[in-house]
């Protein structure tokens, strides 16, 4: 069976029907490049005006304008708000009332696209394997990133969160139109990784999505992650404005000027430092979501009532912090280089500025306890990775899981740890699962490109697709069309249950209290330490166009502009695990 032309609110669209075998039978309808919204520079997205005739939805559209990896050029385009749909089909009748899984890509809110990285037309976020193996509809889409997606003056002149609003527009489009493709508009699961996972979390917390989202999956990221909310957007807006020659004293004039500046210039005016800086690299993630008083009306920790009826899976990779550790402490990955106590202390203090000297010392002490017995470089390097993993991913995810569970009405809560080791040959032998290592398995790459993978990789992929799509279908990862290797029990506040995802998943893979000692440290010991306040006014970004990044505000978690009043009104916020 195949859909043919589908009538949407924008008009007719026609994709392609791809047979899954030479013998006929099952197939997948694929639609690429359906417009879901339009947007002007640094403005909220608007609904698309539609088209006449039949739109041929056969090619991915360009990604949203962003800097290249080298950060010296741009690619993509401003006209980028398009989505892609995969609909599995059986032999006879077209699919009807299928669960819908909407993917939100990661990339530090700075880069990425709905189709993902591409090697010889093999796109990372190709939804075919998930759709056909799990019998679900998969949707991917583009949203604005970098300054064009998240630049904010912290007030009504440039409220920011444009990229989040793009995401919302895509989810709302799916709600309104997916029935025409054979999807169930009342069974939408949003899922994402890294910045996409934090986006998933933020979308579930936003009042704008009331009634749109049934379930959610966050892979390595949460709204509570220290890198997910910019607490001092004006600082970074001024940095960009100076670079492109816009006034900075009046936010209204600054916003007006930025909106008519060449979008490529805005994009290139910001560079993420990839060489070691004074502070950990995540502090330089400038253009990320903000508490705007509207789309995100309050600190995320206060918005968990909005998730009471949204089933949630959240988890991390066991060495998610490795990617960040290699930038902050480059010796971590180099066998011939050593990590020193001083290196680690500098990293710790950079992540605990809100609590000053006492915070840094207490944190350093608990993380280096094992060093007395085992002062080996391997142990020290693993400590660095564990620390970054805890701070950036584990602790925020654990707090979020607890919040979700505590506020749940009908909602179910599940937790996982992805531990299938990285396949990167250049990594140390002690390496676990790095940040983003889970993506290839969720998207079924071991099946799509079998020559590049081992049987054990296919086992991991099969299990993840089964759990993920069962969850999308029923709200329970164990119940659905796909058999699973073991029963995944829900998360409880008492036991902190989680599924450890490895190449061999058995009943022993259900574990409890992940890194409980460290969780207690961050949530209790560290939390009660007195907060120190820095001086915002001493910060000066570099005048020239060099690679040197400005010092991030030292107390950037403490000072939150309260929209829609101007940025000079500052509300003191309690520290959330020190960020």
């Amino acid at each position: 069976a195949k859909l043919g032309a589908v009538y949407t609110e924008g008009g007719f669209v026609e994709g392609v029907n791809k047979k899954l075998s030479l013998l006929g039978g099952d197939s997948v309808d694929i639609f690429k490049g359906i417009p879901f919204a339009t947007a002007k520079t640094l403005e909220n997205p608007q609904r698309h005006p539609g088209w006449q005739g039949t739109l041929k939805a056969t090619n991915f559209k360009k990604r949203c304008l962003q800097a290249t990896i080298t950060q010296d050029n741009t690619y993509g385009q401003e006209d980028c708000l398009y989505l892609n749909i995969w609909v599995p089909q059986g032999r006879k009748q077209v699919s009807h009332n299928l669960p819908v899984m909407v993917w939100i890509y990661g990339g530090a809110f700075l880069m990425g696209s709905g189709q993902g990285a591409n090697f010889l037309k093999n796109y990372l976020y190709d939804g075919e394997e998930i759709a056909t193996r799990g019998n679900v509809i998969v949707v991917t889409f583009n949203y604005r990133v970098g300054p064009l997606g998240f630049l904010s003056t912290g007030d009504a002149n440039l409220p920011g969160n444009f990229g989040l609003r793009d995401q919302h527009m895509a989810i709302a489009w799916v709600k309104r139109n997916i029935a025409a493709f054979g999807g169930d508009p009342d069974n939408i699961t949003i899922f994402g990784e890294s910045a996409g996972a934090a986006s998933v979390s933020l979308q579930t917390l936003s009042p704008y999505n009331k009634g749109l989202i049934r379930r959610a999956i966050s892979q390595s990221g949460m709204a509570l992650s220290p890198w997910a909310i910019q607490k001092n957007p004006l600082f970074w807006a001024k940095t960009i404005a100076k670079k492109v020659g816009c006034p900075t004293e009046d936010t209204g004039k600054m916003a007006a000027c930025l909106k008519i500046t060449d979008p490529r210039a805005l994009t290139l005016a910001y560079k993420l430092p990839v060489k070691k800086q004074e502070y950990p690299v995540v502090h330089y993630l400038a253009f990320i979501p903000v508490i705007d008083g509207d789309f995100i009306p309050d600190d995320p920790i206060n918005l968990y009532n909005n998730t009471a009826d949204i089933d949630y899976i959240a988890g991390i990779n066991n060495m998610d912090g490795h990617l960040f550790a290699t930038i902050d402490v480059p010796a971590v990955d180099k066998t011939k280089q050593t990590v020193t106590e001083e290196d680690f202390y500098r990293l710790v203090s950079g992540h605990t500025v809100a609590k000053g000297l006492k915070g840094a010392q207490a944190t350093f002490d608990i993380y280096t306890e094992s060093w007395a017995q085992d002062p080996s470089q391997e142990n020290m390097k693993k400590t660095v990775v564990a620390f970054e993993t805890d701070v950036l991913f584990l602790i925020p995810t654990e707090i979020a899981l607890a919040q979700h569970k505590a506020h749940a009405k009908s909602a179910k809560t599940y937790s996982y740890l992805f531990s299938h080791p990285s396949r990167m040959p250049i990594y140390p032998k002690w390496m676990g699962a790095d940040h983003a290592d889970d993506l290839q398995y969720v998207f079924g790459k071991p099946f799509a490109t079998p020559l590049g993978y081992r049987p054990q990789d296919r086992a991991v992929s099969k299990a993840m697709i089964a759990y993920w799509t069962n969850f999308a279908r029923s709200g329970d990862p164990n119940m659905g069309n796909s058999p699973v290797p073991t029963h995944w029990y829900p998360y409880t506040l008492e036991n902190g249950n989680y599924l450890d995802i490895t190449k061999t998943i058995t009943s022993a893979s259900m574990k409890e209290h992940l890194r409980e000692k460290f969780l207690k440290f961050w949530a209790v010991t560290f939390e009660v330490l007195p907060t120190v306040t820095g001086d915002q006014d001493t910060l000066t970004p570099p005048e020239d166009d060099s690679e040197v990044a400005p010092d991030p505000p030292s107390d950037d978690s403490q000072v939150v502009p309260v929209p829609p009043t101007d940025d000079s009104v500052e509300a003191q916020m309690p520290a959330t695990i020190g960020f």
């Epitope: 032309a5 009538y7 006449q52 029935a179």
Partner: antibody
Framework: QVQLVQSGAEVKKPGASVKVSCKAS????????MHWVRQAPGQGLEWIGV????????SYAQKFKGRVTMTRDTSTSTVYMELSSLRSEDTAVYYC????????????WGQGTLVTVSS | DIQMTQSPSSLSASVGDRVTITCSAS?????LNWYQQKPGKAPKLLIY???SLPSGVPSRFSGSGSGTDFTLTISSLQPEDFATYYC????????FGQGTKLEIK
């Protein structure tokens, strides 16, 4: 100017089929979708479906799937709506209506065709 | 399908009155239009995209709203305005409100 001229009134017996035509003029026929909407006596408006005259693509309201067929003849700039297995509740005025622009409202309407289903 | 609920179902008013008709969608919608229909005639487009007037429609007609709640306002009723008004949402499965009959008081 845009004109949509529909065929005349029809009286049909239950179980029969009816085919209503709508001839378009004053614009490029293949450039705009054509919708069919009906209105039972004293009742509101009900969308039946839509056809793209360019390639013949159609979409029907769930309620009418399996009973309705929309076709077009580009040589005469005419669209047709055929409804089968008629029942008394199909008695209504049937309108063709052209899109105004883009994905837009129904900007131009035919004069309507009364279809009466009676034994 | 998205349900469209108009209120009131009917109302009586006098020439010169200001009249408001509301339309509520069962879920958030992108495209909302208003039509006027007189007895024995085809509907006529009055407002599109919630607030835009097609050429030839008098400026006393205005529309507003977004999301799920929309309003049609006639600022000063004229004799030719007595008719039935329908809201219409444009989605993959378009639907109409049940209509509001505007009668002379």
């Amino acid at each position: 100017q845009v004109q949509l001229v529909q065929s005349g009134a029809e009286v049909k017996k239950p179980g029969a089929s009816v085919k209503v035509s709508c001839k378009a003029s004053g614009y490029t026929f293949t450039s705009y979708n054509m919708h069919w909407v009906r209105q039972a006596p004293g009742q509101g408006l009900e969308w039946i479906g839509v056809i793209n005259p360019g390639d013949g693509a159609t979409s029907y309201a769930q309620k009418f799937k399996g009973r309705v067929t929309m076709t077009r003849d580009t040589s005469t700039s005419t669209v047709y709506m055929e409804l089968s297995s008629l029942r008394s509740e199909d008695t209504a005025v049937y309108y063709c209506a052209r899109d105004y622009y883009g994905s837009s409202p129904l900007g131009y309407w035919g004069q309507g065709t009364l279809v009466t289903v009676s034994s | 399908d998205i349900q469209m609920t108009q209120s009131p179902s009917s109302l009586s008013a006098s020439v010169g009155d200001r009249v408001t008709i509301t339309c509520s969608a069962s879920q958030s919608i992108s495209y909302l239009n208003w039509y006027q229909q007189k007895p024995g005639k085809a509907p006529k487009l009055l407002i599109y995209d919630a607030s835009s007037l097609p050429s030839g429609v008098p400026s006393r007609f205005s529309g507003s709203g977004s999301g799920t709640d929309f309003t049609l306002t006639i600022s000063s009723l004229q004799p030719e305005d007595f008719a039935t008004y329908y809201c219409h949402q444009r989605s993959s499965s378009p639907t109409f409100g049940q209509g509001t009959k505007l009668e002379i008081k």
